[in-house]
């Protein structure tokens, strides 16, 4: 960067090189050029010459003032006009940064995705800091009192093999950058309570012609967890509100769920599951689209085959699911 240049003097910032966004700052330039009493000192920000708020302090030093500095990063350099020199002489350069101290991390969540071999911990980092911010995840066994720390820039995957201190842990997150440090509340976890079953996937859909046509959704999961509760949500693509059906599921075979839907309408389906009675849900599965027919022929939609446009008999029916707004979080 700009800091790798050979300097003939110094450039520095008050109160510091990295500072809180929105501050008023002063940038000083002091020339130390042999055989040069500078006629004029110039400041450049990102290669553009600054024309205002420059004060000459003495023969060798000038100050540039910025009010309410809002740029996350800027490259500053200053030059001198020396007598008998045709070009400006470079004095020095500096990369400056502005940002915010971290917020207190909240919504700390740790889950174990089945078969992953990892405990994944995430949190809400709060507002953007604009500067390099690191997070230390503390994991302390409630049985052995042993504490492990993991450094990361965002979330963390911790191998379950490294969690040797039993089943109960305290987890908390420290956020730190050059402007400050904050610590989350402690989250108490039991490893058996945070497992999320292997992802449930909708594989296909078919609408069977009957007196009242019905749509069957086929879905499955590779989970080995015995007691699993699932939700399937669906809506016409033109609607805002989801209908939700709940299931207690045994994944020893492919699930078939029946829906009585309006004809000639494009629907979207998603499914998610959790270990029965536990806290965390899977994220909703990817969107699965199915269009109901207008007339008699049977219509099948397969996963990733997003649309079916057959037309068939128009028969009105009402879903039995309850209504919910689309604001459920991914894992709880």
């Amino acid at each position: 960067g700009i800091t790798n240049i050979n300097c003939s003097g110094h450039i520095w910032v008050e109160p510091a090189t990295i500072f809180k966004m929105g501050m008023n700052i002063s940038i000083y330039c002091q020339a130390a050029i042999k055989n040069c009493q500078p006629r004029k000192l110039h400041f450049y920000k990102n290669g553009i010459k600054e024309r205002f708020q420059i004060t000459r302090i003495n023969k060798t030093t000038a100050r540039l003032w910025y009010k309410n500095f809002l740029e996350p990063h800027a490259s500053m350099y200053c030059t001198a006009e020396c007598p008998k020199h045709f070009q400006e002489t470079l004095i020095c350069g500096k990369d400056i940064s502005s940002g915010y101290p971290p917020d207190i991390p909240d919504e700390v969540t740790c889950v174990i995705y089945e078969y992953s071999g990892n405990m994944t911990c995430t949190w809400n980092a709060g507002k953007l800091t604009y500067i390099d911010t690191k997070y230390v995840v503390h994991v302390k066994s409630l049985e052995t009192e042993e504490e492990q720390q993991y450094l990361t820039s965002s979330y963390i995957n911790i191998s379950t093999d490294s969690l040797q201190g039993g089943k109960k842990y305290l987890v908390w997150v420290q956020a730190a950058n050059a402007l400050g440090m904050e610590e989350s509340k402690q989250l108490q976890i039991h490893l058996d309570d945070i497992v999320i079953p292997s992802a449930a996937v909708i594989s296909r859909a078919e609408t069977i012609n009957a007196t009242v046509p019905k749509t069957i959704i086929y879905w499955d999961s590779q989970t080995t967890i015995e007691k699993v509760s699932c939700e399937m949500r669906y809506k016409a693509t033109t609607n805002q509100t989801w209908n939700v059906k709940e299931f207690d599921t045994n994944f020893t075979y492919v699930q078939q769920s029946e829906f009585y839907l309006e004809p000639n309408i494009k629907y979207v389906f998603q499914v998610r599951c959790q270990e029965t009675g536990k806290r965390y849900w899977q994220p909703w599965s990817s969107l699965f689209f199915h269009k109901t027919p207008e007339t008699v022929p049977q219509v099948t939609s397969k996963a990733f085959q997003h649309d079916t446009w057959n037309s068939g008999l128009t028969v009105a029916s009402i879903s039995t699911g309850h209504l919910t707004s689309d604001n459920r979080g991914d894992i709880g």
């Epitope: 800091t3 110094h10 520095w12 008050e14 109160p15 510091a16 090189t17 990295i18 500072f19 809180k20 501050m23 008023n24 700052i25 002063s26 000083y28 002091q30 004060t55 302090i57 003495n58 030093t61 100050r63 003032w65 009010k67 990369d95 390099d132 690191k134 050059a178 402007l179």
Partner: antibody, heavy 117, light 107 residues
Framework: QVQLVQSGAEVKKPGSSVKVSCKAS????????ISWVRQAPGQGLEWMGW????????NYAQKFQGRVTITADESTSTAYMELSSLRSEDTAVYYC??????????WGQGTLVTVSS | DIQMTQSPSSLSASVGDRVTITCRAS??????LNWYQQKPGKAPKLLIY???SLQSGVPSRFSGSGSGTDFTLTISSLQPEDFATYYC?????????FGQGTKVEIK
């Protein structure tokens, strides 16, 4: 030659406030910022905050936020540091310092503040 | 906040010895590091600024080096007047922070 001259020693009761002054001479007072640094007996140096005299901009260490107020009077070339809600741990020598290069190249002689009941 | 860690916390040396004091920052601070000397009952005195620039009037036996997180103050040949406590200080971000100090004593 720049000189920073601080006010004299103070003895204060816990819960009270102290205001230390720092008068600059021999240079343009408003050209550079003034920082306040304290040193408890037998301990290291601790930065408390900074003021840009000409602009009135301040920046305080979080540890002192809400208890310290740094001000400057350009007309008398004097900076002030007021610390409130004093406790015994605030017993220290308080220095004002100014940097005309990166770092503090001019320091006041220090003001001993003793907090005792 | 950026933590500054000096080592050693104290050392004994003789006149003429070469003395090295190190300072480590808890995160990269570029070259925004200054070194001070303090004698009992006196205000600190700036020796080195911007990691390696010798302050005007300071003897050339003092030198500084380093960038990023690791910095060194070297006294090439210790003189009787150099027995004092030395502090590093970062000016990269507020709060400005100092190392805990290194006391150089006579052996």
């Amino acid at each position: 030659q720049v000189q920073l001259v601080q006010s004299g020693a103070e003895v204060k009761k816990p819960g009270s406030s102290v205001k230390v002054s720092c008068k600059a001479s021999g240079g343009t007072f408003s050209s550079y910022g003034i920082s306040w640094v304290r040193q408890a007996p037998g301990q290291g140096l601790e930065w408390m905050g900074w003021i840009s005299a000409i602009f009135g901009t301040t920046n305080y260490a979080q540890k002192f936020q809400g208890r310290v107020t740094i001000t400057a009077d350009e007309s008398t070339s004097t900076a002030y540091m007021e610390l409130s809600s004093l406790r015994s741990e605030d017993t220290a020598v308080y220095y004002c310092a100014r940097g005309t290069v990166p770092g503090f190249d001019y320091w006041g002689q220090g003001t001993l503040v003793t907090v005792s009941s | 906040d950026i933590q500054m860690t000096q080592s050693p916390s104290s050392l004994s040396a003789s006149v003429g010895d070469r003395v090295t004091i190190t300072c480590r920052a808890s995160q990269s601070i570029g070259e925004d590091l200054n070194w001070y000397q303090q004698k009992p009952g006196k205000a600190p005195k700036l020796l080195i600024y911007a990691a390696s620039s010798l302050q005007s009037g300071v003897p050339s036996r003092f030198s500084g080096s380093g960038s990023g997180t690791d910095f060194t103050l070297t006294i090439s040949s210790l003189q009787p007047e150099d027995f004092a406590t030395y502090y590093c200080q970062q000016s990269y971000s507020t709060p400005l922070t100092f190392g805990q100090g290194t006391k150089v004593e006579i052996k």
